[in-house]
Amino acid sequence: QGGTRSPRCDCAGDFHKKIGLFCCRGCPAGHYLKAPCTEPCGNSTCLVCPQDTFLAWENHHNSECARCQACDEQASQVALENCSAVADTRCGCKPGWFVECQVSQCVSSSPFYCQPCLDCGALHRHTRLLCSRRDTDCGTCLPGFYEHGDGCVSCPTSTLGSCPERCAAVCGWRQMF
């Protein structure tokens, strides 16, 4: 409980709101309202949010803190930032994984799960765009590989191997004849 504050307070302003009988100063972020002020324009009694709870903004009426969210292990989520008294846990995906939204109109609060990023190297392709907010964008086949169907096939190492037209163009067999 604070001492006597300056009497100039506006109940309709940002800093003081009518709580119970009087216009009271709100609680800072990370604190909840234990008891409203006991005099006009006084300080409310505010307590720090207990562990695993938070309040992100200055508030006047919150008599309890919000529970911190737990990242969904089933959806392969990890905590990018742990919960504090003033901020909720920030869940995301570990390196090498990307966010796949579970709803069509995706916003920051939308439910999501984590998918492993495509490894372009394992597909013998160039990495055109690195995986972060969406899956890796793979480009053309790496040197020594040619497009065949949906994948990249290794250039044959001898003339005995069959080398279709696309293979010949990439692997350079045509020049050998």
Partner: antibody
Framework: QVQLQQSGGGLVQAGGSLRLSCAAS????????MSWVRQAPGKGLEWVAT????????YFPDSVKDRFIISRDNAKNSLFLQMNSLRAEDTAVYYC????????????????WGRGTLVTVSS | DIQMTQSPSSLSASVGDRVTITCRAS??????????MQWYQQKPGKAPKLLIY???NVESGVPSRFSGSGSGTDFTFTISSLQPEDIATYYC?????????FGQGTKLEIK
């Protein structure tokens, strides 16, 4: 006209409980904070509890905090005082009163009072 | 808590006398230019009745012989011409901050 009709007083053993009621009429009950004030036999007035109008926050002096509960039923224009863990020193006439707010100064005065109800706590 | 000290604790006066009761608060009860102080009258066996609010404002329906004055910590309640029906105990009370506190009362008797 404004009326505050009290009930629920009586004799109770120390450690016991009692619930006082105050039925309000003649004014818009929801627009007023309400209080309880007590007076021990032959003694002065002592504020016991107040409940705010809109959000029903409650306030108590240290002498009754954690033992008394003030509540209101706006639908029934009624005020209540639940008194638990009663002690001999809680023996008094209990009055309910309306708190009128004056102007924009957040200033309250008890402008109407009930007739009082006697609570006797025997040890 | 704000302590309210009232004096005298009792007094005897004659009908027609000017009667003065004082009340001192342990700290200022001023807020935003208003003294958050009131005076109540309690007749024997009856509930208290509000007479004066904000130190000097006479409640509606209260006879004009009752008045109040003062600011900060020192307040005075006056009956300009005592009437037989004024026999009662008078209390000051502050609303500056909780807990609300009353003076111990002044018992007024007719000589």
């Amino acid at each position: 006209q404004v009326q505050l009709q009290q009930s629920g007083g009586g004799l109770v053993q120390a450690g016991g409980s009692l619930r006082l009621s105050c039925a309000a009429s003649g004014f818009t009950f929801t627009s007023y904070a309400m209080s309880w004030v007590r007076q021990a036999p032959g003694k002065g007035l002592e504020w016991v509890a107040t409940i705010s109008d809109g959000d029903s926050y409650s306030y108590f002096p240290d002498s009754v905090k954690d033992r008394f509960i003030i509540s209101r039923d706006n639908a029934k224009n009624s005020l209540f005082l639940q008194m638990n863990s009663l002690r001999a020193e809680d023996t008094a006439v209990y009055y309910c009163a309306r708190d009128r707010i004056y102007g924009s100064v957040q200033y309250y005065a008890m402008d109407y009072w009930g007739r009082g109800t006697l609570v006797t706590v025997s040890s | 808590d704000i302590q309210m000290t009232q004096s005298p604790s009792s007094l005897s006066a004659s009908v027609g006398d000017r009667v003065t009761i004082t009340c001192r608060a342990s700290e200022s009860v001023e807020f935003s230019g208003t003294s958050l102080m009131q005076w109540y009258q309690q007749k024997p066996g009856k509930a208290p009745k509000l007479l004066i609010y904000a130190a000097s404002n006479v409640e509606s329906g209260v006879p004009s012989r009752f008045s109040g004055s003062g600011s900060g910590t020192d307040f005075t309640f006056t009956i300009s011409s005592l009437q037989p029906e004024d026999i009662a105990t008078y209390y000051c009370q502050q609303s500056r901050k909780l807990p609300y506190t009353f003076g111990q009362g002044t018992k007024l008797e007719i000589k």
